[in-house]
Amino acid sequence: YDFTNCDFQKIEADYLRTISKDLITYMSGTKSTDFNNTVSCSNRPHCLTEIQSLTFNPTPRCASLAKEMFARKTKATLALWCPGYSETQINATQAMKKARKSKVTTNKCLEQVSQLLGLWRRFIRTLLKKQ
């Protein structure tokens, strides 16, 4: 999906109002220094591409974050503010819902969510630079 035509201001508002709180709740008990940020992004569409990938694409050591509250809110936000996102992406993530068996917050998942927080912060920074 090409995130170029998204309403970035509205996405930022949703992130600051609600998604960020859920990400921080997920990370509770860990320190910001526990993980190194290895994933980066260069502009707003690129940041959203990386956020989409890290949130919804399962990895071997963190099967799926897609059922977490922050992920559901991310999906809702992208559906609202990125025209065409729903049609191209929602069906693709339904299979991941089914793949998830039990809710286990592994260290790898915490690391992945730490990367997500970094990407979101980068998204906000690139937004501020443009204004």
């Epitope: 309403d7 509205k10 949703d14 109002r17 609600t18 998604i19 559901r72 809110k73 999906k75 809702a76 936000t77 559906a79 609202l80 503010w81 025209p83 065409g84 729903s86 049609e87 929602i90």
Partner: antibody, heavy 120, light 111 residues
Framework: QVQLVQSGAEVKKPGSSVKVSCKAS????????ISWVRQAPGQGLEWLGV????????IYAEKFQGRVTITADTSTSTAYMELSSLRSEDTAVYYC?????????????WGQGTLVTVSS | QSALTQPPSASGSPGQSVTISCTGT?????????VSWYQQHPGKAPKLMIY???KRPSGVPDRFSGSKSGNTASLTVSGLQAEDEADYYC???????????FGGGTKLTVL
């Protein structure tokens, strides 16, 4: 069962406000969009706005901006639509409608409608 | 933010096919595949018949079909039946600011 149940008919004076409720049951309220659509007597459908409780987003039709307020109480699975500064042209049946999960612009479930009459 | 344009009326005999058009702009119908159609019988709430311009929700007969070309969407009802007599409304997503637009409605009469 899966349904939206709206509050009863209202008669209001011009200049006053009306608040209509819409109670959801049989589905996860917060995940869907709840839109409000009105229909004046003998007229077509007109969209007023939507709320997506999951992310606390509301979007209003430009025509009603500043006059309509849509809220939701997830603890009771109830959405509300308040319209202020009522005039006779606001006499209509007001429907709440469920927007599909992540496809908030398709209304696959409707309330029974609430008739709001504005008359002096 | 004007409504989508539909013919006020359409008619057909039982067993025939009838097509209702809905014309918008490149900012709504032409810009997205997010067109839906609703059926409304007198005194009743609308019912979703078509979404994503050509998909049918479960329970909607396959006599109802949707299509789209450019800025115009169409609803075709084939094998008309008496119970198809109703008002039909098209709707389109219209971007993140306007969100949803409805057509003025078409009264379908089964002769």
């Amino acid at each position: 069962q899966v349904q939206l149940v709206q509050s009863g008919a209202e008669v209001k004076k011009p200049g006053s406000s009306v608040k209509v409720s819409c109670k959801a049951s049989g589905f996860t309220f917060g995940s869907y969009g709840i839109s409000w659509v009105r229909q004046a007597p003998g007229q077509g459908l007109e969209w007023l706005g939507v709320i997506v409780p999951l992310v606390g987003v509301t979007i209003y039709a430009e025509k009603f901006q500043g006059r309509v307020t849509i809220t939701a109480d997830t603890s009771t699975s109830t959405a509300y639509m308040e319209l202020s500064s009522l005039r006779s042209e606001d006499t209509a049946v007001y429907y709440c409608a469920r927007g599909q999960e992540y496809f908030y612009w398709y209304f696959d479930l409707w309330g029974q409608g609430t008739l709001v009459t504005v008359s002096s | 933010q004007s409504a989508l344009t539909q013919p006020p009326s359409a008619s057909g005999s039982p067993g025939q096919s009838v097509t209702i058009s809905c014309t918008g702009t490149s900012s709504d119908i032409g810009g997205y595949n997010r067109v839906s159609w609703y059926q409304q019988h007198p005194g009743k709430a609308p019912k979703l018949m078509i979404y994503e311009f050509n998909k049918r929700p479960s329970g909607v007969p396959d006599r109802f079909s949707g299509s789209k070309s450019g800025n115009t969407a169409s609803l075709t009802v084939s094998g008309l039946q008496a119970e198809d007599e109703a008002d039909y409304y098209c709707s389109s997503y219209a971007g993140t600011d306007i969100f949803v637009l409805f057509g003025g409605g078409t009264k379908l009469t089964v002769l």
